[in-house]
């Protein structure tokens, strides 16, 4: 995934950790926080695998790339990065693997240059609808985010608070229409069973969408029509059985698209005929020669591109009088 990277060479480590009072005087703007490494030349701060329980208050103003990975943050409160003056340069923020289970409304406010945010590998049981928009207004100020990486943020089953995880994530993506400029969205490995139908239509700038390693069974109600800039669509390792005509036509109509469909349990019966015909003609599916049938048993491991219409039959539905118990 596209986590913030750094060419940092000379990192200065800070003094031993001292917890600071909430109302403490902000230190000089360029000192390095406790338990972090800083490179002003690379505009990078790394506070990695240090078991931090909160975001350091004394981040240097020059920071463009901030790594807060492998910590124990638990909760990201409103204004977690709000500083006066603001951290105006911060463009890439990586919070992956920091045991976050709650991200509150306005957690990323006052990061006016934030382009790339990675929250992957955090069990987000409670993601506020206003985590990215910062405001409960129907239309918020546009977020500067261009890349949002949310791979493997699904919490354990017993922590899901009896609500749709898909719905919670989508609510945060759509609130206030703040993410209209989002170009890359990664949602891999989240056990998604479905994709709410309105989500893609409201993210018109998307170039890259990664939905791999989920549990998507169907795309019937998902529209790709508005995603005219979409360049890559990753649907590998889902539970897709077939793509229907409407979906095929929409994908074919996207001018720059590359679709990845490996490792889905394709059902090679009469409903697959249109998809097979389309696969033989289309250039948009990458590695299409690797797609194989999973069902029915007699078709297992057959290559989709090698099938013809005679191979794709459906067992006749018996009239009730002939059905056996």
């Amino acid at each position: 995934s596209s986590s913030p990277t750094s060419s940092a060479s000379s990192f200065s480590s800070s003094a031993p950790f001292l917890a600071s009072a909430v109302s403490a005087q902000p230190p000089l703007p360029d000192q390095c926080p406790a338990l972090c490494e800083c490179s002003e030349a690379a505009r990078t701060v790394k506070c990695v695998n240090r078991n931090l329980t909160e975001v350091p208050t004394d981040l240097p103003a020059y920071v463009r790339n901030l790594f807060l990975t492998g910590n124990q943050l638990a909760v990201l409160p409103a204004g977690a990065f709000a500083r006066r003056p603001p951290l105006a340069e911060l463009a890439a923020l990586n919070l992956s693997g920091s045991r976050l289970d709650e991200v509150r409304a306005g957690a990323f406010e006052h990061l006016p240059s934030l382009r790339q945010l990675d929250l992957s590998h955090n069990p987000l049981a409670d993601l506020s609808p206003f985590a990215f928009s910062g405001s409960n207004a129907s239309v918020s100020a546009p977020s500067p985010l261009v890349e949002l990486i949310l791979n493997h943020i699904v919490p354990p089953e017993d922590e899901r608070q009896n609500r749709s995880f898909e719905g919670m994530v989508v609510a945060a993506l759509l609130a206030g229409r703040a993410l209209q400029g989002l170009r890359r969205l990664e949602l891999a490995s989240n056990h998604f069973l479905y994709l709410p139908r309105d989500v893609l239509a409201q993210l018109p700038s998307l170039r890259h969408l990664d939905l791999s390693n989920n549990s998507l069974v169907s795309l019937t109600y998902v529209s790709f029509r508005n995603l005219t800039h979409l360049e890559s669509l990753h649907l590998e390792d889902n539970a897709l059985k077939v793509l229907h005509n409407g979906t095929l036509a929409e994908l074919q109509g996207l001018p720059h698209i590359r679709v990845f469909l490996d490792n889905n349990p394709w059902v090679c019966d009469c409903h697959m005929a249109d998809m097979v015909t389309w696969l033989k003609e289309t250039e948009v599916v990458q590695g299409k020669d690797r797609l194989t049938c999973a069902y029915p048993e007699k078709m297992r491991n057959r290559v989709l591109l090698e099938l013809n219409s005679a191979d794709l039959d459906c067992d006749p539905i018996l009239p009730p009088s002939l059905q056996t118990s």
């Epitope: 909430v22 109302s23 005087q25 902000p26 703007p29 360029d30 208050t57 240097p60 103003a61 020059y62 409160p77 409103a78 204004g79 977690a80 709000a82 006066r84 003056p85 603001p86 951290l87 105006a88 340069e89 409304a105 306005g106 406010e109 006052h110 006016p112 240059s113 910062g134 405001s135 409960n136 207004a137 100020a141 500067p144």
Partner: antibody, heavy 127, light 112 residues
Framework: QVQLQQPGAELVKPGASVKMSCKAS?????SYWITWVKQRPGQGLEW???????????NYNEKFKSKATLTVDTSSSTAYMQLSSLTSEDSAVYNC????????????????????WGQGTSVTVSS | DVLMTQTPLSLPVSLGDQASISCRSS???????????LEWYLQKPGQSPKLLIY???NRFSGVPDRFSGSGSGTDFTLKISRVEAEDLGVYYC?????????FGSGTKLEIK
């Protein structure tokens, strides 16, 4: 429209404390700092400190650290400043102001300032 | 603390004249992210201050274009090209780059 409402005046005795309010309306209270400024009669302005209502985190001018305590009540969109151990030197007008992004330009989202001010609370310390 | 020195303390002008106010900081107020948080505020008699200029030279919304700000590093200037009666009051510069944030001592613009 954005408004910051402050009570007009407070009369307090030397050695006592006073807690003044600044009630915000017309915007998302938790998304902007509240700054407090002191102005003594015929003198200039002094920054006391500020508080971010979203997190409750406050910053203080070292000079006022043992004098002022800043708090917020997000449920009523109200910021408070308590001044303790009052003396005649604390007689002044105290203004609250909103600090945050100025949505006046798309080209520079890094523009922040104190864009709205309360009318001020006049504190008189007298026995 | 960063000391903000304003000159003059008092500026008598005739309506229609140009006025110029200087503000000098005791150290650079360029923040380490490259921004200079230098603002100008006007306080009219009996009122609270109002924002005129932010980040050295940007006019706040609703501020007439006869107001302009300039400068860099430690030296800053506010100019009013043609003074009008509603411009009278005390002008303060303010640095929001280094804690504690500090105001200038103020310049009183008055009619000659």
């Amino acid at each position: 429209q954005v408004q910051l409402q402050q009570p007009g005046a407070e009369l307090v005795k030397p050695g006592a404390s006073v807690k003044m309010s600044c009630k915000a309306s017309g915007y998302t209270f938790t998304s902007y700092w509240i700054t407090w400024v002191k102005q003594r009669p015929g003198q200039g302005l002094e920054w006391i400190g500020d508080i971010y209502p979203g997190s409750g985190r406050a910053n203080y001018n070292e000079k006022f650290k043992s004098k002022a305590t800043l708090t917020v009540d997000t449920s009523s969109s109200t910021a408070y400043m308590q001044l303790s151990s009052l003396t005649s030197e604390d007689s002044a007008v105290y203004n609250c102001a909103r600090y945050g992004p100025l949505f006046t330009t798309v080209v520079d989202p890094n523009s922040y300032a104190m864009d709205y001010w309360g009318q001020g609370t006049s504190v008189t310390v007298s026995s | 603390d960063v000391l903000m020195t304003q000159t003059p303390l008092s500026l008598p002008v005739s309506l229609g004249d140009q006025a110029s106010i200087s503000c000098r900081s005791s150290q650079s107020i360029v923040y380490s992210n490259g921004n200079t948080y230098l603002e100008w505020y006007l306080q009219k008699p009996g009122q609270s201050p109002k924002l005129l200029i932010y980040k050295v030279s940007n006019r706040f919304s609703g501020v007439p274009d006869r107001f302009s700000g300039s400068g860099s590093g430690t030296d800053f200037t506010l100019k009013i090209s043609r003074v009008e009666a509603e411009d009278l009051g005390v002008y303060y510069c303010f640095q929001g780059s280094h804690v504690p944030f500090t105001f200038g001592s103020g310049t009183k613009l008055e009619i000659k």
